[in-house]
Interface confidence: low
Amino acid sequence: IQVMSQLSGRRVLVTGFPASLRLSEEELLDKLEIFFGKTRNGGGDVDVRELLPGSVMLGFARDGVAQRLCQIGQFTVPLGGQQVPLRVSPYVNGEIQ
């Protein structure tokens, strides 16, 4: 078994969600898309989003957005009435061969 991993140039992994967060899947994804969709937050147009265990993957329509967000690395995002500190890191595509 070989695990092939590849950095995705247009995707990021958002982590750090507290267990106390009271949002539905759709609400969480919508709020993250709105926040990271804003250029003033370093983001850009989101064209794919996926809820993963304890994290969210966001994909952007243009090159450079994911890299910029990963360079900043730390964001405090309004979610469910809280100011939630989140981390943004490169998204790694993995597949088992």
């Epitope: 750090g16 937050n41 370093g42 690395g73 730390q74 405090t76 100011q83 500190p85 981390r87």
Partner: antibody
Framework: VQLVESGPELKKPGETVKISCKAS????????MNWVKQAPGKGLKWMGW????????TFADDFKGRFAFSLETSASTAYLQINNLKNEDTATYFC???????????WGQGTSVTVSS | DIVMTQSPAIMSASPGEKVTMTCSAS?????MHWYQQKSGTSPKRWIY???KLASGVPARFSGSGSGTSYSLTISSMEAEDAATYYC??????????FGAGTKLEIK
């Protein structure tokens, strides 16, 4: 949330000073830390910030060269080091946490550094 | 670099008077914040994201603006409001610059 800075320093020109900023009441690596200079009777001047998760520092143009930011993550502490001190480094230095919308939501009490021969 | 110009540099107001101070940016900014600092103490976040009041800030304070022009207003001046107020912008490069401050005194 509390940011507690180290005590006042009296130094001679050419010496080095290292100021600490100990954070408590939150997860240290979830928020970046800024450093801000205030010379006597003057306004606030942003020096830069350090990403407390990656350790990557970012410096304002006027603070590139003699200045260093560092972390001791296990102790939830950020440090500012100034090398080859000059008289114009005499100031109060504040650490301040990056918060919502990139505002500085919590500040240390400030550390006074006096450089005099 | 984005330059922040605060005006006036110094102003005084009588109790009950309405106070407005302004902050002008040399180019459009992403976020604007205001801090209050009293002599011998560290600054406090006062208004963030243009118009949101920080916890504990009296409702007589308000913030407004967009693009390059922003203001802080006190609807009815009180003695405890005497302080220096700094505006601060965040944009992508460099992330932060402060205005020179407006010193507000009580008459």
């Amino acid at each position: 949330v509390q940011l507690v800075e180290s005590g006042p320093e009296l130094k001679k020109p050419g010496e080095t000073v290292k100021i600490s900023c100990k954070a408590s009441g939150y997860t240290f690596t979830n928020y970046g830390m800024n450093w801000v200079k205030q010379a006597p009777g003057k306004g606030l001047k942003w020096m830069g910030w350090i990403n407390t998760y990656t350790g990557e520092p970012t410096f304002a143009d006027d603070f590139k060269g003699r200045f260093a930011f560092s972390l001791e993550t296990s102790a939830s502490t950020a440090y500012l080091q100034i090398n080859n001190l000059k008289n114009e480094d005499t100031a109060t230095y504040f650490c301040a946490r990056y918060g919502y919308s990139w505002a500085m939501d919590y500040w240390g009490q400030g550390t006074s550094v006096t450089v005099s021969s | 670099d984005i330059v922040m110009t605060q005006s006036p540099a110094i102003m005084s107001a009588s109790p009950g008077e309405k106070v407005t101070m302004t902050c002008s940016a040399s180019s459009s900014v992403s976020y604007m914040h205001w801090y209050q600092q009293k002599s011998g103490t560290s600054p406090k976040r006062w208004i963030y994201d243009t118009s949101k009041l920080a916890s504990g800030v009296p409702a007589r304070f308000s913030g407004s603006g967009s693009g390059t022009s922003y203001s802080l207003t006190i609807s009815s001046m009180e003695a405890e409001d005497a302080a220096t107020y700094y505006c601060q912008q965040w944009s992508s490069n460099p992330p932060i610059t402060f205005g020179a401050g407006t010193k507000l005194e009580i008459k």
